[in-house]
């Protein structure tokens, strides 16, 4: 109950940390104007990924998308790329985990395969989480490195009569649900991992006890083996997902208490 | 069509405070702001401030501890308070709306003449 | 405050002229978020309010003139009347609309030679 339960939240806190990856990567407001120690004006300017954004104070919005690559600057180019990858990785992830769901059923899906998808989905997760965090410290790294130079050129080289206003950008909306947004994915992926463990647990519980006859001593790899939950008909010994990686020369049967029937 | 109507007193004492309320119609408050602007006889336009769509104000600096700008939209009307005025209010007040871009002022009323005197 | 300085302050021009008034700016008046700039022209005759002529320093307000133009950009600016009309005798004043509080020029008279 409790695996299901782990399970589950680490795919509903993942969907909801994907969707605001998402939702980061297309919003406008990475980057605004900052208006703390500037000269108010009726404009006001904000930056996204993809497009800068004038808006005026009647409402009036104007966007224009940055229509060219070469001319965009690298880090700019490497914030979308991350952000795209950790899209891309959330999505490939979320499809995973739904058919690694306990609570979903999908023809007679062993618990090995469920435990393997549950742990692939959930590094999928933390990488895409991972990904988003990066994308957006580095923007915000750009941000602090720019505001600072644009400070300092505020203050240099106002010999003449004519002021000019150099608008500095300090952080937007976008940077905080990016950075909320990849810390769910973190902490989903995290818990499906955790999960994974449960689905594989390290005794065999058994339903349908086997008798032998006592001459016949037959071994088990410990753990390595689960009795059928009962499901239809099948009586039969099924193979789960082994926590650890073994070689084949490691696979072998040593006695245990859970050895003999 | 896009109409603006200044009215109030043609005459106010010197440290009283001045009110006037600019009418509008054939446009939507919610949608474009309202600036007031004033012109003292055989000079040029000085602006007072505005109130944009959403209830924010802007002031004059020169006159931002004197001056109040607000909005009735049940009544279509804009207002302008002026405290403590003296013989320098005495202008012509427009209120002119504020153009969907451009910050510009699109269109303007046709004023009302405020004269401050004992 | 921005400090928005007209010249000349009065103009005589004949009939099918070129008409040519200047604006300054104490600051930049250029949006870099949109490379515009925030000046702003108007015409008024005598006894009637200002008419908006020209926004974003070179945009004509629809129904204006085509012989009505702006040029300029940062801080100095220019409204030129390409062939002078009788109807153009007015004050025409420049504004900035970026920086608040929003300034006007002190206005140039235009008259006929």
């Known amino acids: 109950m409790a695996v299901t339960a782990c399970q589950g939240l680490g795919f509903v806190v993942s969907l909801i940390g994907i969707a605001g990856i998402i939702a980061a990567t297309c919003m406008d407001q990475w980057s605004t104007q900052d208006l703390y120690n500037n000269p108010v004006t009726a404009v006001f300017n904000y930056q996204g990924l993809w497009r800068s954004c004038v808006r005026e104070s009647s409402g009036f919005t104007e966007c224009r998308g940055y229509f060219t690559l070469l001319g965009l600057p690298a880090m700019l180019q490497a914030v979308r790329a991350l952000m795209i990858v950790g899209i891309v990785l959330g999505a490939i992830g979320l499809l995973v985990s739904i058919f690694a769901l306990k609570c979903i059923r999908i023809g007679s899906m062993e618990d090995s395969a469920k435990a393997n998808m549950t742990l692939t989905s959930g590094i999928m997760f933390i990488v895409s989480g991972l990904c988003a965090i990066a994308g957006v410290s580095v923007f915000a790294n750009m941000l602090v490195t720019n505001f600072w130079m644009s400070t300092a050129n505020m203050y240099t080289g106002m010999g003449g009569m004519v002021q000019t206003v150099q608008t500095r950008y300090t952080f937007g909306a976008a940077l905080f649900v990016g950075w909320v947004a990849g810390g769910l994915t973190l902490i989903g992926g995290v818990m499906m991992c955790i999960a994974c463990r449960g689905l594989a647990p390290e005794e065999t519980n058994y339903k349908a006890v086997s008798y032998h006859a006592s001459g016949h001593s037959v071994a088990y790899k410990p753990g390595g083996f689960k009795a059928s939950t009962g499901f239809g008909s099948n009586t039969k010994n099924k193979k789960i997902y082994d926590g650890g990686a073994r070689t084949e020369d490691e696979v072998q049967s040593y006695p245990s208490k859970h050895d003999y029937v | 069509q896009v109409q603006l109507q200044e009215s109030g007193p043609g005459l106010v004492k010197p440290s009283e405070t001045l009110s006037l309320t600019c009418t509008v119609s054939?446009?939507?408050?919610?949608?474009?702001?309202v600036h007031w602007i004033r012109q003292p006889p055989g000079k040029g336009l000085e602006w007072i401030g505005v109130i944009w769509a959403g209830g924010s104000t802007n002031y004059n600096s020169a006159l931002m501890s004197r001056v109040t700008i607000s909005v009735d939209t049940s009544k279509n009307q804009f207002s302008l308070k002026l405290s403590s005025v003296t013989a320098a209010d005495t202008a012509v007040y427009y209120c002119a709306r504020a153009a969907y871009y451009g910050n510009g002022l699109d269109y303007w009323g046709q004023g009302t003449m405020v004269t401050v005197s004992s | 405050d921005i400090v928005m300085t007209q010249s000349p302050d009065s103009l005589a021009v004949s009939l099918g002229e070129r008409a040519t008034i200047n604006c300054k700016s104490s600051?930049?008046?250029?949006?870099?978020?949109?490379?515009?700039?925030?000046l702003t022209w108007y015409q008024q005759k005598p006894g009637q309010p200002p008419k908006l002529l020209i926004y974003?320093?070179?945009t004509g307000e629809s129904g204006v003139p085509d012989r009505f133009s702006g040029s300029g950009s940062g801080t100095d600016f220019t409204l030129t009347i390409s062939s002078l009309q009788a109807e153009d005798v007015a004050v025409y004043y420049c504004?900035?609309?970026?920086?608040?509080?929003?300034?006007f020029g002190g206005g140039t008279k235009l008259e006929i030679k």
């Open positions: 600051q930049t008046l250029l949006n870099s978020g949109n490379q515009k700039n925030y």
């Open positions: 504004q900035n609309a970026y920086f608040y509080p929003f300034t």
């Open positions: 054939g446009f939507s408050l919610t949608t474009y702001g």
């Open positions: 974003w320093a070179s």
